[in-house]
């Protein structure tokens, strides 16, 4: 559950993503079938580092309307190309 | 704590090669994704390209298809293969490895390409 992923997270607030909370983060996206809202909102509090993290192609994914939360500092580090997927993702959600 | 050391930089003829070398030490973290960076005298850095967790790569409108970005796991090193250089090419390379939470940097290697 997203309480489980939180209460795993919590525990390792402030310390870098180990390769097994990693695995277990994927597993769980995987799992829910999409990078919702309510899972993005919970890893970007943790990691506002998140989305800048994953290639184009998944992002490309992501639903706009998971976008619509985002803050301008946790796409600090994101690369061109990948803004060049979140951008008219993000329009979208706020045209929505 | 994460250091990223840089190599290969150097002066080129214009039509050249070159490979640029990053070296990873430290952590070992879920996600990362490498990328290059450079600076021009009096220039923004601007971002050149990027490997990512996936494996997947992305490049720069002016570097696409001139550089090849790569990387060597068992050796945590990142590459940037540089072809058919320009004298627009001359510049500090940076190498930057994006976590889930951070961001590091190497202090950047030389590359000077001569018409």
């Known amino acids: 559950s997203l309480e489980t992923l939180k209460a795993l997270l919590e525990v390792n607030k402030g310390h870098e993503m180990s390769p097994q909370v990693a695995t277990l983060i994927d597993r769980f996206v995987k799992g829910r079938g999409q990078l919702d809202k309510d899972t993005l909102d919970t890893l970007t509090a943790f990691y506002p580092g998140y989305l800048c993290s994953l290639s184009p192609e998944e992002l490309s994914s992501v639903p706009p309307s998971s976008i619509w939360a985002v803050r301008p500092q946790d796409l600090d580090t994101c690369d061109p190309r990948q803004l060049d997927v979140l951008y008219p993702k993000a329009r979208l959600a706020f045209q929505n | 704590q994460v250091q990223l050391v840089e190599s290969g930089g150097g002066l080129v003829q214009a039509g050249g090669s070159l490979r640029l070398s990053c070296a990873a030490s430290?952590?070992?973290?879920?996600?990362?994704?490498m990328r290059w960076y450079r600076q021009a005298q009096g220039k923004q850095r601007e971002w050149v390209a990027s490997?990512?967790?996936?494996?997947?790569?992305s490049y720069s409108d002016p570097v696409q298809g001139r550089f090849t970005i790569s990387r060597d796991n068992a050796r945590n090193t990142v590459y940037l293969q540089m072809n058919s250089l320009r004298p627009a090419d001359t510049a500090v390379y940076y190498c930057?490895?994006?976590?889930?939470?951070?961001?590091?940097w190497g202090q950047g290697t030389q590359v000077t390409v001569s018409s």
């Open positions: 930057n490895l994006g976590t889930a939470l951070s961001s590091y």
């Open positions: 430290g952590s070992t973290f879920g996600r990362i994704v």
């Open positions: 490997i990512y967790d996936s494996g997947s790569t």
